[in-house]
Each structure stands twice: as C-alpha cells, then as structure tokens.
Interface confidence: medium
C-alpha cells in the first residue's frame, strides 16, 4: 500500500523535511503533490510526468520544493504554514489511480528559560511562593525540577497557566531545593539554571538532649537544646521557671536529687519572630534509671564496620535483654552477646541491620525499655545502572541517560564520556546528538560517606546505518528435551525491528519457537537435534538493514537404542562373527560389548573369527554419551549350528 | 491546434471485424496516453480502451475485453482500434480521445467527432 | 466496478438560472470525477476534472465540487449555450461514465 512517511515527523522551523514515499507502484503515468488531506487543484503543489520528465509547479508551489524521480518530496527552509496535510497522488499505467496522505508538524527552536519569583524569602506555612518559567513560548511544554527530580505529586503544588507557572502553597522547609524548569516541544528542550528557594521556619518545638530524664546523684548534667530553624534559633535555659543563662548548651556537675525539676528550653528567630519552648522533667534518683542505648559507631558502614550496641547504665547483679525489631533476637553469626548481655554487637552490618533496637532492664517487678534505636547503615554504592538500555541511536534524536546506584547516604553522580568528565548530575541530556557522540559514556557514583565509588561503563553508538548484528546465545551445547536455548540479537537499538532466518528462511510455527524482548530474543523450549540449523538475526530501520553471521546450534542428544548390523542372528559354525553396533548420538558415543554378560571390548565393532556353538549366546552393545550423561544398550541373541546341519543359515561375514 | 481524425467505421455483420483508426496532430503525440469512448444511438457515452504512450499499457471495459485491440504507431502519429467479433450491442458512434499530460486525475482533453459503427445482418 | 447515478436524468431551466446536477459514486472515488458537456450531434467537451478544477478555456459559471461519493456541478447563471446533455465521468478503474442530464430550456 501507498504511505508517505515524513522525516522528521515534527521539523525545526528553517530546518528541511523529506516526505518519503513508500510502495511507490511500478509502471507509472506521473504524480503530483497537494497541500491538505485530498486532491485539489487549486492546492497542488508540484506535478511530474514520467514520460516527458516533465515537472509542472502547482498554485501551491513555494519555490522551496523538490520533487525526486521516486515521488519524494523534500521541503526546505520550513516556516511555521507548512505544518499539516500532504497527499501524493499517483497515476499508474493504465491510468488507475493511487493516492496517500502524510503530515508532519512544525515547532521553533526554543531559547534557555529562565525562572522568576513572587518571593524570595517565604515564611513557612504562612507564604504561597509562584515560580514562572520565561519567556513564554506557543506550543511549548514546561516541566519543572526539584533537585533534578520531576515534580512530586502534593496538593500544596499547583501547575497554572499551561504548566509555566509552579505554585508552592504554604511553603515548608522541605521546599527548600534547587528548582529548574524546563521547556520542550518536538524539536528541542532547554532547561534554566538552578533556583534554591530559601525557606524562613521556625523555631520548631526545641528538642533537649540527651532524652535521658533520669539521673543519678552525682552525675554531671550537661543538656543541650536544638530546634530547626532557619536562620538559626537563639537559645534560652530556664530550671523551674527562672532563668539560667542564654546558650545552647546546659551544663550542672555532680547533680543531687535537689537538682530535679522542670528544664525549659526557649528557642527564638529573629527574622520569623515566633518562639518556642520545651520543657523536660529530670529525676535525680539513687536507683537505677530508665535504661537507654549507646553506640559505638553512629554511622556504620555495611560490610565493613562492625558496631556495639551498649543497654546503659550499667549496674550490678542486673539482667539485660536486647529486641530487634520488636522481636526477640534471632539466632545469627553476625549477632554477639558480652558474657553480662550488655553489649551487642553486630558484626560487619548491612543495610537490612537498621534496627530499630531496644534494650531492657529487668527488676523483680517488671522490665523497664529503653528507647529504640536505629542505626544509618551506610552502603553503597551498587553498581550503577543506566538506562535505557538502547545502545545503539540514530543521529538527530536526543540522549536523555539517567543513573541510579542503591547508596546510603545518596550517591553523588559523575558522567565521563570517553573518560572526559562531563557533569556532575544523575542524568545527561545531550539534545539532536550526531555521530560524534559515539563512544564510551560511563557513570560514576560516588558515596561520600563511605568514600567508595563505582562505575558502569556503556558503549553507545550512533549511526544512521546500522551495524552488524551479532548472536549471543544462553547456553551453547544444549541437551535434547531438556534444555531452552535463548538467542539475543546484539546490540539493542532504538526504533529498530529484530527479524531471524532459521537455515535462510522465516521462522517455522512453533509451540517451541516463542519471540519476547521486542523480537530481539528468540527462544527455543525443549530443543530437539532438528534445531540443529543456522540461526541469522536481523535489524532494520527505516535507513538500513543488515544481517549477522549465522549461529550453528550444537544440540547434544542421545544415545539413541543402538542398532547391530547385520541383522542375521543364525550362523554356521567356522564362520567369522563381524557385529558393528551404531547409534545416533552427538557427540558420538562410546561403545562397548558384552557377550553373556561378560564385557568384552570398548570398540564400535565386535569380531570373532570362525566361530563355534560354543558362541552360542546373548551380545549386548552399550553405548554412553558423557556430555548428555545418557546411556542405552540393545541385546541380540546369536545362534551357531554345526556345519551342515541347518539349512539357510549365514556363511558369516 | 489539436486536432483528432476518426475514421473506418461503417456497417458490418454480427461475427464481423473492423478497424478504426484516428489521425492525430496538433500536439506531441508519442507522449500522450489516448483513449477510444463510445456512445450508441440515443444514449450515454461509455469509455471502452486507452493506451500508454509506448504502448507499453492498455486498459480495457469488461464489455470489450478479448474482442477488441487498442494499438498506436508514434510514427504515423496514429491510434487504432482492432474490433473482432462484433455484436448488435456494439453499434455506436465512436471517439478517439485523447488524456492531456498533466492528467490529475485522468481526463480527457480533446475528443475526434467520432465514426459510426454499426453491426447489423 | 464503481457505478456513477447522476441526478436528476432531465432539467428544464431559464436563462440566468442557478442550476445543479448531482452525481453520486457506488463507493469512495476521492477526488477522481470529471464532467463533461456534449451537444446533439457533436462529441463531448471537458468541463471540469479533479472534482473542482476549471478546464482551460472553460468559462468561470462552470464549478464543481465533492469529495468521496458526492459531486456537484453547478451553473451559476445559464447562458443559452448551456443548454446540453452533461456527464459526470470518474477516473478510478474503469473510467465510466454517468448516465447524463438533459439540460432543456423551460
């Protein structure tokens, strides 16, 4: 059937697009081009007579038009009117007519954004902050960026007015991030440099550490108060409602029971004018107080540190219990208890070792919890993953990469293109990419944390043409009805369809053939020694095709029930016994005889000279094929008469 | 000035054979498709053969089809129609014709004043 | 094959009328009809092709349009040469013709 494709689907403006035409028919009279969905003359653009070679512009022929021996017609310096409709029609030889329609759609290439602000220091849950992404741009998409992630889905976050303008309602500290936004139509996509929106909050409710509210006599008593804040909060103490002193820090030595009492922290901002406090009650005791968790390493990392975990306080002829996520420990290698059970330890930690944790102190009455705790394992960075997949892309489109690798904290990323740093971000975007971005594109991930990093490296190629496939296979000796083999053609690509050939031709239909992956892998279930063939994979584009070598599946199979030949089983005596044993296998198997049960030789043919009734008897031949592990045997029973004495019997061999 | 020249109709028995031939000049004729369109007495026109230029392609009506032949020489500038096999039904009055070179869709531009056939016993 | 209805088969009409002829296709022939106009005794005269396309030398109260399986030909003022026999003629496969529309003086 008659189709026009056109290249690009959606063009530049003063870029050129080719209307391609596929299925052109053989023996024709001429065509002609029309703008719109129908012929029209009043509408035509160019028109071609074969014959005369002849090509007569149209009413609607703008001098920026081409027309090829094929019908293809290429429009150059586009401008915005020649978005729409183009019909060829195509009149054949004997005058039967043909017609097809195409389109494309034309777009500006657009300039950086850049972002404005209604506020730049909002109050958090009083001010509404409206970002708007400039300039503004006629069929143009705008997506915003928080930290280079997409938008996360709130109700305090409003896209107005085409999705240019973002809207944060009741901003929180949490909105504090890098916003960028991001203009794209078909033909390109420009991002605007980073906005940081600087949240004022503040003071929350002071948190005074440590929790610990039960002391004993004797003890030093050193509070420290902290409330987020932003700017920072200023500091006030209070015992009992008087004041102490304006510092963030509390600090009572050798306490007695008549340092009980309220503690109150007063935390201040000056640029929000709100003031919070919180108040903590201590109990100075001379008995033990509520128990709570110590650690050795706050910030383990997995595999490589081990950390102790230690139930405070400690006191005497006391029994210590330990939970792990509110279950009782479990039994593990990786878990020590210290003789007294006050410590435990979990050595070289993994990320599943969060906790929470929590200790406890048992008395004659009853057992006293500490608080949890979790533990920030620190780990990573995997092995980063990119995707896509693709490896292969044709010139003109764009390189959108992203990486990910698991990492605690989150791994900061680097991309290297042919071992040149490129940016420092988690995704790369490289727009209308050509050939020369050909190459070696590796991301890093590095965890700052942990120091250690990691890499993946990914070859892209880009090429118009296509290249070479090549087969790769999961298992290259598969056992007869046993074993799958799965073919992939390499390299994945792009808009590309995967075609295969079995010994040069199409698929057969198969219950045991099955194609997944996009067609890219081709799957035999249960195979059999007849797949034993030449597998070829193909990809092709709209620009190219090519084939790759054949692959030759090596199927091992049997050993088959063997055949003895001849087939006679009566001889006469004095004559010669030639018995050859053959079974279908691959590899070929190794054979061997027995005679009476008796084993003979390990050779494929058994030969007795002038034989005797005394070689009377059963002849077994058993073959063996190691690579299938399988054996068979078949048994003959051979009969020798005295000379003379019974007639049609075998003179031998 | 485009002119077409029918001529070799007349009258014929049923089973009969006649050829119409049609004198072109005025335009380039090696190049253009032509066409033969009939029309018996007292009713509508019905298109019947065209040829391509090199006589490479015909095209025929299923009323016509194994009877008739449609041919051209380019150098006597000369369309002509084979009738074999003639019947009652095909008596008409018939016109060469011929399609234009910008022909989108086909048409036909100029027409012959046309010879009458009539097959009668 | 596709079969060609023009209606209506006669017409009487005055000079200075707006006339028109209809002619419906069997199927979808895109914009592939062409009319023509033939008085007694003489051979036809292309009028209009592609549906909507103005012969060279045709005069402009001549006009067509349609697409697909409805076509119209209109005379947007007859002039005493207008009155003829008019066919409609599509150029599919094969290329028949209507059955024709008398135009008559009233």
């Known amino acids: 059937k008659l189709t026009i494709e056109s290249t690009p689907f959606n063009v530049a403006e003063g870029k050129e697009v080719l209307l391609l035409v596929h299925n052109l028919p053989q023996h024709l009279f001429g065509y002609s081009w029309y703008k719109g969905e129908r012929v029209d003359g009043n509408r035509q653009i160019i028109g071609y007579v074969i014959g005369t070679q002849q090509a007569t512009p149209g009413p609607a022929y703008s001098g920026r038009e081409i027309i090829y021996p094929n019908a293809s017609l290429l429009i150059q310096n586009i401008i915005q009117n020649d978005t729409g409709f183009y019909t060829l029609h195509v009149i054949k030889s004997d005058l039967v007519n043909e017609e097809a329609t195409g389109q494309f759609r034309v777009y500006p290439e657009l300039p950086k954004p850049s972002i404005s602000s209604n506020n730049s220091k909002p109050v958090e849950d009083k001010d509404a902050v409206a970002f708007t992404c400039e300039p503004e741009t006629q069929d143009a998409t705008y997506l915003w960026w928080v930290n280079n992630q997409s938008l996360p889905v709130s109700p305090r976050l409003q896209l107005s007015n085409g999705n240019r303008t973002l809207t944060l309602f009741n901003v929180t500290r949490n909105d504090t991030a890098s916003y960028k936004c991001e203009t794209q139509n078909p033909v390109s996509a420009r991002r605007s440099d980073s906005v940081i929106l600087n949240v004022l909050y503040g003071p929350d409710a002071p948190t005074i550490s440590p929790l610990n509210t039960s002391y004993r006599s004797g003890e030093n008593l050193n509070l420290s108060c902290h409330a987020a804040s932003n700017p920072p909060a200023q500091y006030s103490w209070f015992v009992n409602g008087t004041f102490q002193q304006s510092t963030q820090e509390l600090f009572i030595p050798n306490i007695t029971v008549n340092n009980s009492g309220s503690y109150t922290c007063q935390a201040h901002n000056s640029d929000t004018g709100l003031n919070r406090t919180t108040v903590t009650t201590i109990t100075v005791y001379a008995e033990p107080p509520k128990p709570f968790i110590t650690s050795n390493n706050s910030n383990p990392v997995e595999d490589e540190d081990a950390v102790a975990l230690t139930c405070e306080p400690e006191i005497q002829n006391t029994t210590y219990l330990w939970w792990v996520n509110n279950q009782s420990l479990p039994v593990s290698p990786r878990l020590q208890l210290s003789n007294d059970n006050r410590t435990l330890t979990l050595l070289s930690v993994t990320r599943n070792d969060v906790g929470p944790y929590e200790c406890g102190i048992q008395n004659e009455l009853s057992v006293d919890h500490s608080d949890p705790v979790i533990l920030n394992v620190l780990y990573g960075p995997d092995d980063p993953t990119i995707s896509p997949s693709y490896t292969y892309y044709r010139p003109g489109v764009n390189l959108s990469l992203s990486c990910h690798a698991a990492s605690n904290p989150p791994a900061q990323y680097s991309w290297l293109i042919d071992g040149n740093i490129q940016q420092h971000t988690q995704e790369l975007f490289i727009s209308n990419i050509t050939e020369k971005n050909s190459g070696l594109y590796t991301c890093q991930a590095n965890n700052s944390a942990s120091g250690h990093s990691r890499t993946t490296v990914k070859t892209i190629t880009v090429s118009a043409e296509l290249p070479k496939p090549s087969i790769s296979s999961n298992n290259s000796k598969p056992v007869e009805d046993k074993d799958a083999v799965a073919f992939t053609c390499e390299p994945e690509a792009q808009n590309t369809t995967y075609l295969w050939w079995v010994n040069g031709q199409s698929l057969p239909v198969s219950p045991r053939l099955q194609l997944s992956n996009g067609n890219r892998t081709l799957t035999l279930f249960n195979v059999t020694r007849n797949d034993a063939r030449a597998y070829v994979c193909g990809i092709q584009n709209s620009v190219s095709a090519n084939r790759s070598d054949p692959v030759t599946l090596d199927v091992l199979y049997g050993p088959d029930t063997p055949i003895i030949s001849p087939p006679d089983s009566s001889y006469l005596s004095g004559a010669n016994l030639n018995l050859s044993c053959h079974s279908a296998s691959n590899p070929s198997p190794q054979y061997s005889w027995r005679i009476n049960g008796i084993p003979q030789q390990h050779t494929q043919v058994l030969f007795i000279a002038k034989i005797t009734p005394n070689n009377n008897g059963t002849y077994a031949c058993f073959v063996s094929n190691l690579a299938t592990g399988r054996n068979n045997s078949i048994v003959k029973s051979i009969t020798v008469s005295a000379s003379g004495t019974s007639p049609g019997l075998s003179a031998g061999a | 000035e485009v002119q077409l020249l029918e001529s070799g109709g007349g009258l014929v028995q049923p089973g009969g054979s006649l050829r119409l031939s049609c004198a072109a000049s005025g335009f380039t004729f090696s190049s253009s498709y032509m066409g033969w369109v009939r029309q018996a007495p007292g009713k509508g026109l019905e298109w019947v053969s065209s040829?391509?230029?090199?006589?490479?392609?015909?095209s025929y009506a299923d009323s016509v089809k194994g009877r008739f032949t449609i041919s051209r020489d380019n150098s006597k500038n000369t369309l002509y129609l084979q009738m074999n096999s003639l019947r009652a039904e095909d008596t008409a009055v018939y016109y060469c014709?011929?399609?234009?070179?910008?022909?989108?869709?086909?048409?036909?531009?100029?027409w012959g004043q046309g010879t009458l056939v009539t097959v009668s016993s | 094959d596709i079969q060609m209805t023009q209606s209506p088969s006669s017409l009487s009409a005055s000079v200075g009328d707006r006339v028109t002829i209809t002619c419906r296709a069997s199927?979808?022939?895109?914009?592939?009809l062409n009319w023509y106009q033939q008085k007694p005794g003489k051979a036809p005269k292309l009028l209009i092709y592609a549906a909507s396309s103005l012969q060279s030398g045709v005069p402009s109260r001549f006009s067509g349009s349609g697409s697909g399986t409805d076509f119209t030909l209109t005379i947007s003022s007859l002039q005493p040469e207008d009155f003829a026999t008019y066919y409609c003629q599509q150029a599919g496969n094969p290329h028949t013709f209507g059955q024709g529309t008398k135009l008559e003086i009233k």
């Open positions: 199927q979808s022939i895109s914009s592939y």
């Open positions: 014709a011929r399609y234009p070179s910008v022909l989108f869709p086909p048409h036909l531009d100029y």
């Open positions: 040829i391509g230029s090199g006589s490479y392609s015909t």
